[in-house]
Interface confidence: low
């Protein structure tokens, strides 16, 4: 590849914002490569040299009145100025999250399990996920990956509970997230669809067969029991 | 107390690359950047454009001020060039993943310097442009930069992919691996057992019960025609 | 397991076309990220690469030989043919094909090759 | 074409370590992964080393590859008279595929 020395020159101007603008703070800093040399922050009301390499910018800058005017209005005139024109798109977004669970891994029941509570697609990052075991909140055996930022204005999470599904047992996951008016639920049953259908369908059939079986052997042997001579020879002849 | 929200003025000037860039961060996503060789404002999201406009040709003013500042500072410095950190490098989906449903791989690549990375797509070892996408170069606290990659694909068991990032911190390309993770299917022991012992026990019955309830039923009607002895 | 042989005349006149096939077991070739290549090394001499085809039929060839060679697949017969125009006595060599599974750029399975020799 | 440099022949003692070196460009070696194969008397090639330092399953640890920048090398401790073989180093050049001139091994004593 290209070997050449490389030289990096990086200036960031930061708004911080408390309490939406009722408290406002201006830094604008230099850095070489990762190294900041000089700063202002508004809190200070002048340039202050970060590093050594930032002496000669924080005396030539002070020493400009025009500058640091400039440079102490700019909480108004650059920070409060822009969270105006951004905030319906910004500071107001909000991206209601979709939220799927599902077991990390197909293991049978009585087994330990990963339940993974997937939240994709919301924005602003603020979520609140919990887990609950037929209705009780568990705290153990947490685990989350954090808070995922997609680089689009979506954020994802993935939460995941360790535990060992029983028969019966339902697992739901809730999330808060500033873009609902009232909690998110999804549940997930101990067993699946297909073993559920697999159960109710063996059971039924089996029900079924017993009520014909009985209810055939009762018209038989009431018959029988009437009229014990007049039986036909032969099966079903 | 903790901040609620940040927006940042983030520019660069890289020698003896020549190249810049100049992009607003809110809370760490991009609102939008310049494109210096076009001179015009792209917004991260197409939206955005509705509600606010920015003027291109003010950036380029302040990519030259950043390319002169550098060069006094690289004087300063006695020429010290900048140390190579090389990237990590994340390949995650943006939803979950299911068979045949269109989804997009996302590349992340974090915590690198100099904002210069080689990044490809591979799809069975092939690479990939086909719908491909990718973020500027996005400012971290600690000054060192982040990217995004974007793969829209639809999810099969036939194919891997990996993110291919090649940077000057790294001994060679770094290449991450994704493939499709197909979930076995539980084997439902019990339930198969007691679903084939049901149907066949319940089978059995209805037809012995239906043989049973015929010969019942013509009993009867039998015993009706000859009459009492 | 996996298995390539090569098979082709052993010996070639001056200015001929030389064909050569490899046949092989134990893989496809429909199979997504496998390629085929073929690889010739002359007597007492190095290794030297000549021509790979992939799983999509995507062909790739020795800049100094293209235009010269061609290679081509057959996915059902498992068999992938190299031809070679206008042969030379400096292209006496032992040719050899082997498997590439693509991402790693390397040939993890040889053929035991077959030597043909160019003389008139 | 012979892309990668490598010296022509190595030696050593049964039980000493040699190293083979490979040295290559930006746009094969400094950009991609390098292999190593052994070549026995009379035999095809063999895959000894892949993705730079992995060993495929069979392949003794004695065989170790390393790379830096646009050079690879190959190491070989305690040599054995069945290591006396020659050895190449290959990488990929864009859509190419690219060999070292080889270097032949030998084992004293």
């Known amino acids: 590849g290209d070997t050449r020395p490389r030289f990096l020159e990086q200036v960031k101007h930061e708004c911080h914002f408390f309490n939406g603008t009722e408290r406002v703070r201006f830094l604008d800093r230099y850095f070489y490569h990762q190294e900041e040399y000089v700063r202002f922050d508004s809190d200070v009301g002048e340039y202050r040299a970060v590093t050594e390499l930032g002496r000669p910018d924080a005396e030539y800058w002070n020493s400009q009145k025009d500058l640091l005017e400039q440079k102490r209005a700019a909480v108004d005139t650059y920070c409060r100025h822009n969270y105006g024109v951004g905030e319906s798109f910004t500071v107001q977004r909000r991206v209601y999250p979709e939220v799927t669970v599902y077991p990390a891994k197909t293991q049978p029941l009585q087994h330990h399990n990963l339940l993974v509570c997937s939240v994709n697609g919301f924005y602003p990052g603020s979520i609140e996920v919990r887990w609950f075991r037929n209705g009780q909140e568990e705290k153990t055996g947490v685990v989350s990956t954090g808070l995922i930022q997609n680089g689009d204005w979506t954020f994802q999470t993935l939460v995941m509970l360790e535990t060992v599904p029983r028969s019966g047992e339902v697992y739901t996951c809730q999330v808060e997230h500033p873009s609902l008016t009232s909690p998110l639920t999804v549940e997930w049953r101990a067993r699946s669809e297909s073993a559920q259908s697999k159960m109710l369908s063996g059971v039924g059939g089996f029900v079924l067969g017993l009520l014909f079986l009985g209810a055939g052997l009762f018209i038989y042997f009431r018959n029988q029991k009437g009229h014990s001579g007049l039986q036909p020879t032969g099966f079903l002849s | 107390i903790k901040e609620e929200h940040v927006i940042i003025q983030a520019e660069f000037y890289l020698n003896p690359d020549q190249s810049g860039e100049f992009m607003f961060d809110f809370d760490g996503d991009e609102i939008f950047h310049v494109d210096m060789a076009k001179k015009e404002t792209v917004w991260r999201l197409e939206e955005f454009g509705r509600f606010a406009s920015f003027e291109a040709q003010g950036a380029l003013a302040n990519i030259a001020v950043d390319k002169a500042n550098l060069e006094i500072m690289t004087k300063r410095s006695n020429y010290t060039p900048i140390t190579n950190v090389p990237p990590e490098v994340t390949v995650l989906t943006n939803s979950p993943v299911e068979l045949r449903e269109p989804n997009v791989l996302i590349c992340f690549i974090d915590k690198f310097t100099p904002p210069v990375v080689n990044v490809t797509w591979l799809r069975n070892g092939k690479p990939v442009t086909t719908g491909v996408s990718e973020t500027v170069f996005l400012p971290r606290e600690d000054h060192l930069f982040r990217k995004f990659h974007y793969l829209p694909f639809l999810p099969s068991t036939e194919d891997v992919y990996d993110c291919r990032v090649e940077h000057w911190g790294l001994d060679e390309p770094l290449l991450k691996h994704w493939e499709f993770d197909a979930p076995s299917p539980l084997p439902e022991t019990t339930e198969n057992v007691v679903c084939a012992l049901g149907l066949t026990v319940g089978l059995v019955g209805i037809i012995i019960g239906t043989i049973f309830i015929i010969k019942g039923v013509r009993k009867s009607n039998a015993a009706e025609r000859r009459g009492p002895l | 397991q996996v298995q390539l042989k090569e098979s082709g005349p052993a010996l070639v006149k001056p200015t001929q076309t030389l064909t050569l096939t490899c046949t092989f077991s134990?893989?496809?070739?429909?199979?997504?990220?496998?390629?085929v290549g073929w690889i010739r090394q002359p007597p007492g001499k190095a290794l030297e690469w000549l021509a790979l085809?992939?799983?999509?039929?995507?062909?790739y060839y020795s800049t100094s030989l293209k235009t010269r060679l061609t290679i081509s697949k057959d996915t059902s017969k498992n068999q992938v043919v190299l031809t070679m125009t206008n042969m030379d006595p400096v292209d006496t060599a032992t040719y050899y094909c082997?498997?590439?599974?693509?991402?790693?750029?390397?040939?993890?399975?040889w053929g035991q090759g077959t030597l043909v020799t160019v003389s008139s | 074409d012979i892309v990668l440099t490598q010296p022509p022949s190595v030696s050593g003692a049964p039980g000493q370590r040699v190293t083979i070196s490979c040295s290559g460009s930006?746009?094969?070696?400094?950009?991609?992964?390098v292999t190593w194969y052994q070549q026995l008397p009379g035999t095809a090639p063999k895959l000894l080393i892949y993705?730079?330092?992995q060993r495929p399953s069979g392949v003794p640890d004695r065989f170790s590859g390393s790379k830096s920048g646009t050079s690879a090398s190959l190491a070989i401790t305690g040599l054995q008279s069945e290591d006396e073989a020659d050895y190449y180093c290959?990488?990929?050049?864009?859509?190419?595929?690219?060999f070292g001139g080889g270097t032949k091994l030998t084992v004293l004593g």
């Open positions: 085809i992939d799983w999509d039929d995507d062909k």
């Open positions: 082997a498997r590439s599974p693509r991402y790693r750029g390397a040939f993890d399975y």
């Open positions: 134990g893989f496809s070739l429909s199979t997504s990220g496998v390629g």
């Open positions: 290959q990488s990929y050049d864009y859509d190419h595929y690219v």
């Open positions: 993705d730079n330092n």
């Open positions: 930006d746009s094969n070696i400094g950009a991609n992964y």
